[in-house]
């Protein structure tokens, strides 16, 4: 039960995270005009990964796409690449994790296959989250560097009578969305990896444990039983006791070492 919950929660958290990464990547407000200690302008500038926008006081907003590829800073290209890789890995991870969910049964898929798929999706989510966090952090670092450079320019080279309004940019909403989304995807991935340990069938052959039912001595050896598909009766997967029948799923409902993660 705890394994299913951990897996399900990991999937949901990752889903929210990846949706956030996609939203952050598409948002225009990666950097916004710094209004502190600056002349109050009647226009507000903000920039995204794909276009820059200007909003006039009247509400009129004009956005222009970056229609050049070679003319863009290498750092911006790197951030774009990191965010896209994050989205692609996350999307594949989501696809894989849907089939890996314990609550969804597909054919006669073994627990070991579901465990492997859960681990795969978990790793993909972790890498996806790391890509997003790295992308946002690189952009934030670029902003900080440019901010202090433009601040230095504001106080130097003003020997002439004519002043130029230096537009400084600070962190936009997309950065915070990206950081949170990347973190959620990372957490979701870790949860999927933890759930994988609980899904993996027990390989160790424990010593026979004696169960006494109705005075009869029945030896029960835990082993690699195939998971019940749920389609029809599968007597191979049932251990018949004098006291009644219990499916493997019911046997697993007893506390195991994986339930305390």
């Amino acid at each position: 039960m705890a394994v299913t919950a951990c897996q399900g929660l990991g999937f949901v958290v990752s889903l929210i995270g990846i949706a956030g990464i996609i939203a952050a990547t598409c948002m225009d407000q990666w950097s916004t005009q710094d209004l502190y200690n600056n002349p109050v302008t009647a226009v507000f500038n903000y920039q995204g990964l794909w276009r820059s926008c200007v909003r006039e006081s009247s509400g009129f907003t004009e956005c222009r796409g970056y229609f050049t590829l070679l003319g863009l800073p290498a750092m911006l290209q790197a951030v774009r690449a990191l965010m896209i890789v994050g989205i692609v890995l996350g999307a594949i991870g989501l696809l894989v994790s849907i089939f890996a969910l314990k609550c969804i049964r597909i054919g006669s898929m073994e627990d070991s296959a579901k465990a492997n798929m859960t681990l795969t999706s978990g790793i993909m989510f972790i890498v996806s989250g790391l890509c997003a966090i790295a992308g946002v952090s690189v952009f934030a670092n670029m902003l900080v560097t440019n901010f202090w450079m433009s601040t230095a320019n504001m106080y130097t080279g003003m020997g002439g009578m004519v002043q130029t309004v230096q537009t400084r940019y600070t962190f936009g909403a997309a950065l915070f969305v990206g950081w949170v989304a990347g973190g959620l995807t990372l957490i979701g991935g870790v949860m999927m990896c933890i759930a994988c340990r609980g899904l993996a069938p027990e390989e160790t052959n424990y010593k026979a444990v004696s169960y006494h039912a109705s005075g009869h001595s029945v030896a029960y050896k835990p082993g690699g039983f195939k998971a019940s598909t749920g389609f029809g009766s599968n007597t191979k997967n049932k251990k018949i006791y004098d006291g009644g029948a219990r499916t493997e799923d019911e046997v697993q409902s007893y506390p195991s070492k994986h339930d305390y993660v």
Epitope: T41, N45, S52, V54, S57, S58
Partner: antibody, heavy 118, light 113 residues
Framework: QVQLKQSGPGLVQPSQSLSITCTVS????????VHWVRQSPGKGLEWLGV???????DYNAAFISRLNIRKDNSKSQVFFKMNSLKPNDTAIYYC????????????WGQGTTLTVSS | DIVMTQSPSSLPVTAGEKVTMSCKSS????????????LTWYQQKPGQPPKLLIY???TRDSGVPDRFTGSGSGTDFTLTISSVQAEDLAVYYC?????????FGAGTKLELK
């Protein structure tokens, strides 16, 4: 067509306040802002302040302490009030619509001539 | 505050001639975000409120004759009337629409020679 009609007193005594109403037609105050500008022989055209479509205001720092602009969207009216008038506040006061482009003023009221004198 | 300096203060003209007037700002009115200059030109005739002619330094407002042309960037701007008509005799003002408080020039008066 777009129109801005102003109504207000012509003569005000020093230290009194000036109230002007700008009634607009042909557009909605929920879509456009309204600026206030004055013109005097001594100082030329001076921007005083603006009330935007959302109701937020921007004032000229030189007048912020004695200026208040508000509006009633349902009545299509903008209210301008300036306190503590002095003789050098004698001017023609205009309301003007904020153009959608370029932060400019595309339609102007006919003006309210104010004389501050005892 | 940004200071807008217009020259000349008075410009005597004859009908049909080409005239240019200048407007200089104490700070750049060029917005780096969209590469637009936030400078506006107005025309004011006696007893009337100002009328919008040109915004973004060079974009004519609707209904403005094409003999009016705005140019310039940063701090130096020019309004050109290619062939002055009698109805163009008025005072022309430039305005900073970029940094608050929005400020106007003292005007250039176009009058007959």
């Amino acid at each position: 067509q777009v129109q801005l009609k102003q109504s207000g007193p012509g003569l005000v005594q020093p230290s009194q306040s000036l109230s002007i109403t700008c009634t607009v037609s042909g557009f909605s105050l929920t879509r456009y802002g309204v600026h206030w500008v004055r013109q005097s022989p001594g100082k030329g055209l001076e921007w005083l302040g603006v009330i935007w479509s959302g109701g937020n205001t921007d004032y000229n720092a030189a007048f912020i302490s004695r200026l208040n602009i508000r509006k009633d969207n349902s009545k299509s009216q903008v209210f301008f009030k300036m306190n503590s008038l002095k003789p050098n506040d004698t001017a023609i006061y205009y309301c003007a619509r904020a153009a959608y482009f370029g932060n400019s003023f595309d339609y102007w009221g006919q003006g309210t001539t104010l004389t501050v004198s005892s | 505050d940004i200071v807008m300096t217009q020259s000349p203060s008075s410009l005597p003209v004859t009908a049909g001639e080409k005239v240019t007037m200048s407007c200089k700002s104490s700070q750049s009115l060029l917005n780096s975000g969209n590469q637009k200059n936030y400078l506006t030109w107005y025309q004011q005739k006696p007893g009337q409120p100002p009328k919008l002619l040109i915004y973004w330094a060079s974009t004519r407002d609707s209904g403005v004759p094409d003999r009016f042309t705005g140019s310039g960037s940063g701090t130096d701007f020019t309004l050109t009337i290619s062939s002055v008509q009698a109805e163009d005799l008025a005072v022309y003002y430039c305005q900073n629409n970029y940094i608050y408080p929005l400020t106007f020039g003292a005007g250039t008066k176009l009058e007959l020679k």
